[in-house]
């Protein structure tokens, strides 16, 4: 094919691929009709000038994962047809100021994952057709405020994984067509008011993994087309009133891994398209009434790994389409009987690793579609009669790692569990913690004899009376052999369904980092 270099492969479609560590300089001669050239995983360290003079038809040049550290001025001369240029994953520390002057029809320029320490003001001045600029994964600490002034056609700009500590409020003022802006994994501590005001077409804004402490109240007010907003893993301690009021198109919002202590009612303004809200790993201590009332299409709400001690009965008002609620790993001791009343479509609820001592009998009264309830690792000693009776879809109930008190009051729960054992899964069943004569025995299969004294085991140290547990000598193997005396129909029989155990860190859904 017009003299394909031996180190390369050339296709009839005018595509040339050169790869391999043995390549230390650009192979020559390259086919004059080449339209796509890929030079990947080589040991090429520099691009001299006039390198591509004889392949002026080139549209795409991909030079990735090489050892490039030097590009001479004029290296891209005669590539006026080039639309796509990738120099990603090389070792470029600086770029000559006019290095791109011969490729002014570029639509995509990828400079990511190099070692660039600065961008010159005029570096991108001729790129009026540029749609995509990738600068992530470099060592940039600042960018001249006029650097992007001429990129009026830009739709995607990635500045993530650099070392920016601040942004000029006018940096993006000419980027009215921008749809995706990524600033994640930098060192931004605050973002000046007005920084995003010109970005009326922005659909995605990635600010996660910075050091942002405060958000200006009107920071996003001009971004009415925003669909995805990533604010996770920052130092945000509060959300200003109205911060999200002008975001009617938002469908993804991540706020996990911040320092939020409270959520004022209405802070999540009308967002009819928001499906998921990730708030885990904050310091939220309580939830007020109507905190989420504008989010009537929300399906997933993750509040795990906070410090919740109180949830107001109306906190979840308006969440009529919620499917999954994760409240695990908090400090909840008690729940109001009406707290889940408005969650008519809830399917999964995770309440494990709290301090729940008891549950109201009607806690799940209006939540008829529940399929999964995680209550493991709490302080539960018993559960009210009939608490699960109406949950005909329940197929996974986790009750282990609770200090169940297996006295006469446990019989209704015991009987229900006998009839619905498959709902508990197969690997981990709840066991009795007290009295001492039945400690360690399965709550499901234990035989309990009432009335009568506890069966005493051999002498062992007194068990501490923490909390609300009488002191009984501890035994490891004493079993009671007498029969259950109460009726089995204290709990209504439910259709048994096999359940599997899945111990996900954040709840029922894998956490997404944005």
């Amino acid at each position: 094919y017009y003299g394909c270099p031996s180190e390369c492969t050339c296709s009839r479609a005018s595509q040339v691929e050169c790869t391999g560590a043995r390549i230390v300089a650009m192979p020559t001669p390259l086919p004059w009709n080449a339209m796509s050239l890929q030079v990947v995983n080589t040991h090429i360290t520099e691009l001299p000038e006039n390198l591509f003079l004889n392949i002026s038809a080139l549209i795409a040049l991909k030079m990735e994962k090489n050892e490039l550290s030097t590009i001479m001025p004029g290296a891209f001369r005669n590539l006026g047809s080039l639309r796509y240029l990738s120099l990603a994953n090389n070792k470029l520390r600086m770029l000559p100021i006019r290095v791109f002057q011969d490729v002014n029809n570029l639509e995509s320029l990828l400079l990511s994952n190099n070692q660039l320490v600065q961008i010159q003001p005029a570096q991108f001045s001729q790129f009026s057709n540029l749609r995509e600029l990738q600068l992530h994964g470099n060592n940039l600490e600042s960018i001249p405020e006029e650097a992007f002034d001429h990129l009026v056609g830009l739709t995607k700009l990635n500045l993530g994984r650099n070392s920016f500590t601040h942004l000029s409020p006018r940096l993006f003022q000419h980027l009215g067509n921008l749809q995706v802006l990524r600033l994640h994994e930098n060192r931004l501590s605050d973002i000046p008011m007005g920084t995003f005001d010109a970005l009326g077409n922005l659909q995605e804004l990635a600010l996660q993994e910075n050091q942002i402490g405060t958000l200006s109240p009107g920071l996003f007010h001009n971004n009415r087309n925003l669909q995805r907003l990533y604010l996770s893993n920052n130092h945000i301690s509060q959300l200003p009133p109205g911060i999200f009021m002008q975001l009617p198109q938002l469908n993804k919002l991540t706020l996990f891994g911040n320092s939020l202590r409270e959520l004022s009612p209405g802070v999540f303004g009308p967002m009819p398209n928001l499906r998921e809200l990730w708030l885990y790993n904050n310091h939220i201590t309580s939830l007020a009434d109507n905190t989420f009332s504008h989010l009537n299409q929300l399906q997933v709400l993750i509040l795990s790994h906070n410090q919740l001690t109180y949830i107001s009965p109306g906190a979840f008002n308006g969440l009529t389409n919620l499917r999954e609620l994760s409240l695990h790993t908090n400090a909840l001791q008690d729940l109001d009987s009406n707290v889940f009343r408005s969650l008519a479509n809830l399917q999964n609820i995770s309440l494990q690793s709290n301090r729940l001592r008891q549950l109201p009998g009607s806690i799940f009264a209006n939540v008829n579609g529940l399929t999964t309830i995680q209550l493991q690792n709490n302080n539960l000693e018993n559960l009210p009669l009939g608490i699960f009776d109406h949950l005909v879809n329940l197929c996974e109930l986790r009750l282990y790692d609770n200090p169940w008190r297996c006295d006469s009051d446990i019989l209704p729960l015991h009987n229900w569990l006998l009839l619905n054992r498959a709902r508990l899964g197969t690997d981990t069943l709840p066991v009795c913690s007290s009295p001492a004569n039945v400690r360690g025995q399965s709550l499901v299969i234990i035989n309990i004899n009432f009335p009568g004294p506890s069966v005493q085991g051999p002498e062992t140290p007194e068990v501490p009376s923490y909390p609300d547990t009488p002191s009984y000598p501890d035994t490891t193997s004493v079993s009671s052999t007498t029969e259950i005396t109460s009726a089995v129909d204290d709990y209504t029989d439910l259709t048994t369904i096999e359940a599997t155990d899945d111990r996900n860190t954040w709840g029922m859904t894998e956490a997404q980092s944005g």
Partner: antibody, heavy 121, light 107 residues
Framework: QVQLLESGGGLVQPGGSLRLSCAAS????????MSWVRQAPGKGLDWVSV????????FYTDSVKGRFTISRDNSENTLYLEMNSLRAEDTAVYFC??????????????WGQGTLVTVSS | IVLTQSPSSLSASVGDRVTITCRTS??????LGWYQQKPGKAPKLLIY???SLQSGVPSRFSGSGSGTDFTLTISSLQPEDFATYYC?????????FGQGTKVAIKR
Amino acid sequence: QVQLLESGGGLVQPGGSLRLSCAASGFTFSTFAMSWVRQAPGKGLDWVSVISGTGGSTFYTDSVKGRFTISRDNSENTLYLEMNSLRAEDTAVYFCAKAVTVNTRGFFDYWGQGTLVTVSS
Amino acid sequence: IVLTQSPSSLSASVGDRVTITCRTSQVIRNDLGWYQQKPGKAPKLLIYDASSLQSGVPSRFSGSGSGTDFTLTISSLQPEDFATYYCLQDNNYPWTFGQGTKVAIKR
């Protein structure tokens, strides 16, 4: 009589690994959460990790997350701490401790005597 | 959550009333315990849930407080009480200890 006996400590180079064990007796092991607490020489107490009675819930202090793994074998009445990518600042006496309940609480009524882990080149 | 004990050390005589405070950087309800440790020994649980006396611990030990401010009181110091005392919060992961308060014999 409740007894907790730690083992597995010793001298290890930075980046190395150790596995601590804690053999428990005298109580119904599976019905109590267990924890590891460490104490650097001449310093205060530092909570490391906790595991619930079944082993279904585990938690760690931030500095060991991703490096240490707590586990338990309820059939053998043994608690473990797998320690990888060890650093000099992990040097301490490591105590295993029995919680007062099956769920993860920070109240420990019985403690072992500790095993010394030294991380040094 | 940061726990700050005060004082860091104190000297007292047998029979004295001793008070040690523990302040938390965030509200932790009553999810706090107190431990005693003697040199070369493992710690010993004295108080759980801020004010509940652990079984077998002498009644001269008492705990109080809720929210962010907690107190351990020894009503009448005994010779065996000379030790270092630590508070521990288990309201929020990671659980954290205070830096300790050393109670020494007044010379």
